[in-house]
Interface confidence: medium
């Protein structure tokens, strides 16, 4: 807390100036008028003033707005911002994406602070969903941004927002994240003809049920192990080796390469050994012939 | 540690143009702006131009606005000061200056002398 003290003679900023990057803490907090910081805030992101001058210039906006900063003065924040603490973003009320934008380019190139995630969380709040623009904006700024979320906030994201995804921006998904985002994805690229659907699809396989799975078999897709990998065991184990022959195409003979690995070792386990025999691939601990196999959720789904 | 090295100052004729150039090392990642300040003989240092790190907003006093020309490259961690239209009263030893993010401390360079003199 800075003391209340007069200004000294002639000292009264008239204006944000480089003047007041020599003025002491208690200076500017008696000559700086605080509305004249307000509507002057766009020249303090180019005044190379300290830690602590922000510090006094922070709390003399803090005495303006008790209730939350204006749009108009959040906008201009710039580095100011990285002054502001969790509690102070819970009261602003901030719609604009260029204010996003301006505020999450002061934290470029720095991890997710709280400062941001608050941001992120006021901003998403004030808009009811995470539409497209915002999506892209955010993506860009933090790639794992939509993996941060929870299933259900993601369930607020309208398939239209789908199309900002990049790749690159699912990596760090978990199953359940993919099981909420692949629906959304399939409706918004359902227009799509096969190859252009598959390759705008494929990063959300990992949601994908088995009815889907059997249909791309269908479709020449030659899907990568990578892709394969990581999809869903309970979708895979149904498919058949003819089934998972087309849709891995060329890929087919990395399989053995990943034959001890989830979902391949659970799938070969289903198999017939003489089914994955003709892959010719030498894929072993499928069921031995002659035996018979019995489909237990079947004979559940009927007693 | 931040350490500045400024360079490219000398003797020019009044109406002339010089190009100052600070070259930045050390712990740069939290820098938030870097600027040039002067100091004439008897006098007390003033900003002559500042750049934000994050942004390519600059800021220029009157006395020098339109004339000088802050800009960065921050690939090469330089920052520079093009001085068009130089006066006898810009004569002063010129610093680079940096700000961090995260502390109240200015960096300073050893400075660089610009005399403007016939």
């Known amino acids: 807390e800075v003391e209340k003290t007069a200004c000294p003679s002639g000292k009264k900023a008239r204006e944000i100036d480089e003047s007041l990057i020599f003025y002491k803490k208690w200076e500017l907090e008696a000559c700086v008028d605080a509305a004249l910081l307000a509507t002057q805030m766009d020249r303090v992101n180019a005044i190379p003033f300290t830690y602590e001058q922000l510090d006094v210039l922070k709390h003399k906006l803090d005495e303006l707005y008790p209730q939350g900063y204006p749009e108009s003065v959040i906008q201009h924040l710039g580095y100011l911002f990285l002054k502001m603490s969790p509690e102070d973003i819970r009261k602003w009320n901030v719609t604009s994406l260029e204010t996003l934008k301006a505020l999450l380019e002061v934290n470029k190139g720095h991890e997710m602070s709280p400062q941001v995630a608050t941001l992120i969380d006021r901003f998403v709040k004030g808009r009811g969903q995470l539409d497209k623009d915002t999506l892209d904006t955010l993506t860009a700024f933090y790639p794992g941004y939509l993996c941060s979320l929870s299933p259900e906030e993601l369930s607020s994201v309208p398939p239209s927002s789908i199309w900002a995804v990049r790749p690159q921006d699912l990596d760090t998904c978990d199953p359940r994240q993919l099981d909420v985002l692949y629906p959304k994805a399939r409706l918004a690229f359902q227009n799509m003809n096969g190859s252009e659907y598959f390759v705008k699809i494929q990063s959300f396989l990992g949601g994908a049920p088995t009815e889907d799975l059997k249909a791309l078999s269908q479709q020449n897709v030659s899907m990568d192990l990578a892709t394969f990998m990581k999809l869903r065991t309970d979708a895979v184990l149904p498919l058949t080796v003819a089934e998972v022959q087309k849709l891995l195409g060329p890929h087919v003979e990395g399989l053995k390469a990943e034959e001890r690995h989830r979902p391949v070792r659970d799938w070969i386990l289903r198999q017939r050994q003489d089914d994955l025999d003709t892959l010719g691939l030498g894929l072993q601990g499928g069921i031995p012939n002659g035996y018979l196999v019995l489909d237990l959720s079947m004979q559940e789904a009927l007693s | 540690e931040v350490q500045l090295v400024e360079s490219g100052g000398g003797l020019v004729q009044p109406g002339g143009s010089l190009r100052l150039s600070c070259a930045a090392s050390?712990?740069?990642?939290?820098?938030?702006?870097m600027g040039w300040f002067r100091q004439a003989p008897g006098k007390g240092r003033e900003l002559v131009a500042s750049?934000?790190?994050?942004?390519?907003?600059?800021y220029y006093p009157d006395s020098v606005e339109g004339r000088f020309t802050i800009s960065r490259d921050n690939a090469k961690r330089m920052v520079y000061l093009q001085m068009n239209s130089l006066r006898a009263e810009d004569t002063a030893v010129y610093y680079c200056a940096a700000r961090m993010i995260k502390k109240g401390f200015d960096y300073w360079g050893q400075g660089t002398q610009v005399t403007v003199s016939s």
């Open positions: 050390g712990s740069i990642s939290d820098l938030y702006a």
């Open positions: 750049i934000n790190s994050f942004s390519d907003i600059t």
